[in-house]
Amino acid sequence: SGVFQLQLQEFINERGVLASGRPCEPGCRTFFRVCLKHFQAVVSPGPCTFGTVSTPVLGTNSFAVRDDSSGGGRNPLQLPFNFTWPGTFSLIIEAWHAPGDDLRPEALPPDALISKIAIQGSLAVGQNWLLDEQTSTLTRLRYSYRVICSDNYYGDNCSRLCKKRNDHFGHYVCQPDGNLSCLPGWTGEYCQQPICLSGCHEQNGYCSKPAECLCRPGWQGRLCNECIPHNGCRHGTCSTPWQCTCDEGWGGLFCDQDLNYCTHHSPCKNGATCSNSGQRSYTCTCRPGYTGVDCELELSECDSNPCRNGGSCKDQEDGYHCLCPPGYYGLHCEHSTLSCADSPCFNGGSCRERNQGANYACECPPNFTGSNCEKKVDRCTSNPCANGGQCLNRGPSRMCRCRPGFTGTYCELHVSDCARNPCAHGGTCHDLENGLMCTCPAGFSGRRCEVRTSIDACASSPCFNRATCYTDLSTDTFVCNCPYGFVGSRCEFPVGLPPSFPW
């Protein structure tokens, strides 16, 4: 679809005569008839196959034609066509004299013709005007012409229809050849595909408008390049969605089991050395002078009653010191200057000479001890604390410091290891002599039933087209991560490529 435009510029008829040579009375009131038709080697009468147009009276005898002439005429003259421009044409321009106001062909005498010109040739579509001048013996006509495409038609023949649009069926303008030129941010054959945010992950992200990055299930972050770990994952990371790979020192399905209590909580006091011994379990090795589960108790070195023979013990900065009773000496008052003659044995103990009377030994009655039977039997010597408890003398009494897992005056009571519900996923806990045992429900195993052994939802390979399958451990379902070009919950549908333009 296009328009053949003819611009009349000047008509010269100096003598004011008709083609017959007869003069016009009072002058030649001139109008034009134009016929546009298909190319003919010799232009002949016949149908104006490409169209016709007439002007009103434009002037008398000789005159210049102004653009968009008054009197209802249009200059340039428009000859629209609704077909592919063939590139060739024939043009007939007739100048007529109008004696009256009726310009219809049937209302004019045949001899009212002033002049007739006929041209033919090639003409390409374009904005440039072709200037021409035709002269006969009595008249001269100067004009120019061109062919341009109608609005929304493009190409060498005005055959390509293209309408700019900016809606969801395309975001483009039209190039001179009728091809689409996408608006910024859009791509694809119809410019309907948005260009996502720069760096948006090709598989894990997508967009519905330019510079956007929306994440597919299992991915997050500005560019959808960060996987989402398993729901409830505490101290872990992922490299693919729904994983929970534990950070160092953490274990269990959700990486919430502390395997490095020493580092995370520093429970040992007073410079003691901490050793991890299981989940939330540790052992403190105390420095000299300290005791307790966490080495939190300062230990008096006199507590072990190191002074013998009734010597009294005094704590010092760097240890202890024994004050010996008369007749004794040595670091622990262990040496005697007495003999049996001095009756050194107390509490009914019997004295026995040694080394020809240079020394002696006391045989003590029950409940007494010491080299002179001066001490009541140490309540701790009989190891009254069960289950490896530590016995501590406290003046007239004693106390047992129990190992973890035991309680009672003599550490004789076993604290139930099951009390803190250590078995995961509904496992049943059984107390044993030296620990506990978990009986796991179907689908779980491991010391604490922490290992999932249920049927892998991905085992049946439910994802198509080489998609990656991820098991959602919380629901025993699967998620398919589709490769580029496929969609659907199982990636079963190919993303169809739009067919090319029909032209």
């Epitope: 700019k164 900016n166 069926f169 519905s208």
Partner: antibody, heavy 121, light 104 residues
């Protein structure tokens, strides 16, 4: 050949939500060449475009209805759905689902047979 | 909002040419589709992108669009062409239908 089939209740009470589903058979809803639309026609009246959706989830709605309309897509079931909230008697119409083809400049070349929804208490 | 106006009805004798107009502001700058709807049936696309015919649509259906007016022409009209005809265009992101023309 692609076929579209609307389904949903034929009677909805005023102020409630109208819900319809269109099932696509004989072709994939995930093709990049199409939008999937809803059009309605009150008894004895003309056609009114409600909105449409692309398989990736982009939606477009008639401005006069957009506060009440939600269109969604389920590619795994090859279906798309319409929800119209706070309905009144004026929403009584035959509801059509249709395929809008990008290659045809958005022309709807495939239509369902339509389902009449009456809004009445 | 954008509006498309159609004459309510057009009458034509069999074998004659029927012309249905659809007018809207600068409609020639938009692509127009035409739909035929017979009583009790779903609409059928007969013209897209102003003047293109989908496969299966008879050649007697043609379309044009310029200025503010699009026209659907049925030449050599047959009795089976009696139906309602709707024009449709896209304005921004919304579809707009004409009011419809009954061809008898």
């Amino acid at each position: 050949e692609v076929q579209l089939q609307e389904s949903g209740p034929g009677l909805v009470k005023p102020s409630e939500t109208l819900s319809l589903t269109c099932t696509v058979s004989g072709g994939s809803i995930s093709s990049s060449s199409y939008y999937w639309g809803w059009i309605r026609q009150p008894p004895g009246k003309g056609l009114e475009w409600i909105g449409d959706i692309y398989y990736a989830g982009s939606t477009y709605y008639n401005p006069s209805l957009k506060d009440r309309v939600t269109i969604s897509v389920d590619t795994s079931k090859n279906q798309f759905s319409l929800k119209l909230s706070s309905v009144t008697a004026a929403d009584t119409a035959v509801y059509y689902c249709a395929r809008e083809d990008m290659i045809l400049g958005g022309g709807a070349d495939n239509w369902g047979q339509g389902t009449l929804v009456t809004v009445s208490s | 909002s954008y509006e498309l106006t159609q004459p309510p009805s057009v009458s034509v004798s069999p074998g004659q040419t029927a012309s249905i107009t659809c007018s809207g502001d600068r409609l020639g700058d938009k692509y127009v589709s035409w739909y035929q709807q017979k009583p009790g049936q779903s609409p059928v696309l007969v013209i897209y992108e102003d003047s293109e015919r989908p496969s299966g649509i008879p050649e007697r259906f043609s379309g044009s669009n310029s200025g503010d007016t699009a026209t659907l022409t049925i030449s050599g009209t047959q009795a089976m062409d009696e139906a309602d005809y709707y024009c449709q265009a896209w304005d921004s992101e919304a579809g707009v239908f004409g009011s419809g023309t009954k061809v008898t």
